[in-house]
């Protein structure tokens, strides 16, 4: 019962986490204009992974997609890649974990297969969460660096009187959504891995019973038979886990380009 609860909760937490990662990736507010001490601004700039937007005090908002792919900073491309890998791994993990749920019966699927799938999905969720956290953290680091650079030359004087105010950017809502979502996916993954241990049937620890028949002493170990049929944690099963994780890591997904003006 505790295993089912742990697995179910892990699934739900991961589901929320992956939904959050998707939301964060799509959000436009990865970086928002720093308002200093002024909460009301006539022109408010904010940027996402896919487009940058400007909201005017008139209520008019204009967003422009990043039409170029090669002209974008490498860091931004890296963040995009990390978030997409996180989403892809998370989505596959969710798909795998649905079939792995103890409460769902699919044909004559053995508990060991469910345990394998639970572990596979758990690892996928962990990697997915780490990808999201890494992506958001890389972007945040980029923002901090740029913030202090633009603070250093906040006002660049032009001919004494004329000034050019540089726009500084600070953390947007998407970063916090991404961090929380990545954390939830990670926690969900750990819970799935914990549940896997409970799902895999342990070898029954019966004492050997000896039957003495005409001088021959033969010991029957029920656990031994069980292990040989692939129900326990043998090397063949281990290979499945490793192979499964490796296959998912190699999945590459490229974003379809949605540019809005």
């Amino acid at each position: 019962m505790a295993v089912t609860a742990c697995q179910g909760l892990g699934f739900v937490v991961s589901l929320i986490g992956i939904a959050g990662i998707i939301a964060a990736t799509c959000m436009d507010q990865w970086s928002t204009q720093d308002l200093y001490n002024n909460p009301v601004t006539a022109v408010f700039n904010y940027q996402g992974l896919w487009r940058s937007c400007v909201r005017e005090s008139s209520g008019f908002t204009e967003c422009r997609g990043y039409f170029t792919l090669l002209g974008l900073p490498a860091m931004l491309q890296a963040v995009r890649a990390l978030m997409i890998v996180g989403i892809v791994l998370g989505a596959i993990g969710l798909l795998v974990s649905i079939f792995a749920l103890k409460c769902i019966r699919i044909g004559s699927m053995e508990d060991s297969a469910k345990a394998n799938m639970t572990l596979t999905s758990g690892i996928m969720f962990i990697v997915s969460g780490l990808c999201a956290i890494a992506g958001v953290s890389v972007f945040a680091n980029m923002l901090v660096t740029n913030f202090w650079m633009s603070t250093a030359n906040m006002y660049t004087g032009m001919g004494g009187m004329v000034q050019t105010v540089q726009t500084r950017y600070t953390f947007g809502a998407a970063l916090f959504v991404g961090w929380v979502a990545g954390g939830l996916t990670l926690i969900g993954g750990v819970m799935m891995c914990i549940a896997c241990r409970g799902l895999a049937p342990e070898e029954t620890n019966y004492k050997a019973v000896s039957y003495h028949a005409s001088g021959h002493s033969v010991a029957y170990k029920p656990g031994g038979f069980k292990a040989s049929t692939g129900f326990g944690s043998n090397t063949k099963n281990k290979k499945i886990y490793d192979g499964g994780a490796r296959t998912e890591d190699e999945v590459q997904s490229y974003p379809s380009k949605h540019d809005y003006v």
């Epitope: 008139s58 000034q163 105010v165 726009t167």
Partner: antibody, heavy 115, light 113 residues
């Protein structure tokens, strides 16, 4: 079609108060008050977000003037306190548009501060 | 606050003339986010409310004749009337629409020669 109609102007003594109204019909996200002293140029007074009620003022009017709105009546207000002779002007309400331009203006209401 | 300086303060011109009014801001009105300059031009006739002509420094408001055009970026802006018409004799104002408080230029009065 947006229509703006100001009212509430008139003669007031120095140190007195006056509340200007601007009846708004049509979509407005944010509104402004702009004034023009006789024979002088335009002077921006205040701005308000019609949805949140968030205001901002020109430095000369902070503390003396209050911009507000009444959602139910779809009306914009400018409460003017501690009026001075130099506050004598035609007061316009105007709607903010694309590029923060003011595309629709009221006909203006004259405020005269004199003893 | 951003100061707006218009020149000339007044000018005399004839119908059909090409008229240029300049406006200078104390700070750049160019927004890095969308590469647009937040400068607005208005026309005001005596006893009337101002009329929006141009926003984003060069975008013509709907219904405004094409003889009006705006240009400029950063701190220097220009309003041009390619061929002055009788109805164009009025006072023209530029406005900082980039940051609060919004500020207007002192105005340029276009009179008949």
């Amino acid at each position: 079609e947006v229509q703006l109609v100001e009212s509430g102007g008139g003669l007031v003594q120095p140190g007195g108060s006056l509340r200007l109204s601007c009846a708004v019909s049509g979509y407005t996200f944010s509104m402004n008050w702009v004034r023009q002293a006789p024979g002088k140029g335009l002077e921006w007074v205040a701005w308000i977000n019609m949805y949140t009620g968030e205001p901002t003022y020109a430095d000369d009017f902070k503390g003396r003037f209050t911009i507000s709105r009444d959602d139910s009546k779809n009306t914009l207000y400018l409460q003017m306190n501690s009026l001075r002779a130099e506050d004598t002007a035609v007061y316009y309400c105007a709607r903010s548009s694309k590029g923060n331009g003011l595309d629709y203006w009221g006909q203006g209401t004259l405020v005269t501060v004199s003893s | 606050d951003i100061q707006m300086t218009q020149s000339p303060s007044s000018l005399s011109a004839s119908v059909g003339d090409r008229v240029t009014i300049t406006c200078k801001s104390s700070q750049s009105l160019l927004n890095s986010g969308n590469q647009k300059s937040y400068l607005t031009w208005y026309q005001q006739k005596p006893g009337k409310a101002p009329k929006l002509l141009i926003y984003w420094a060069s975008t013509l408001e709907s219904g405004v004749p094409s003889r009006f055009s705006g240009s400029g970026s950063g701190t220097d802006y220009t309003l041009t009337i390619s061929s002055l018409q009788p109805e164009d004799f009025a006072t023209y104002y530029c406005q900082n629409a980039y940051s609060f408080p919004f500020t207007f230029g002192q105005g340029t009065k276009v009179e008949i020669k």
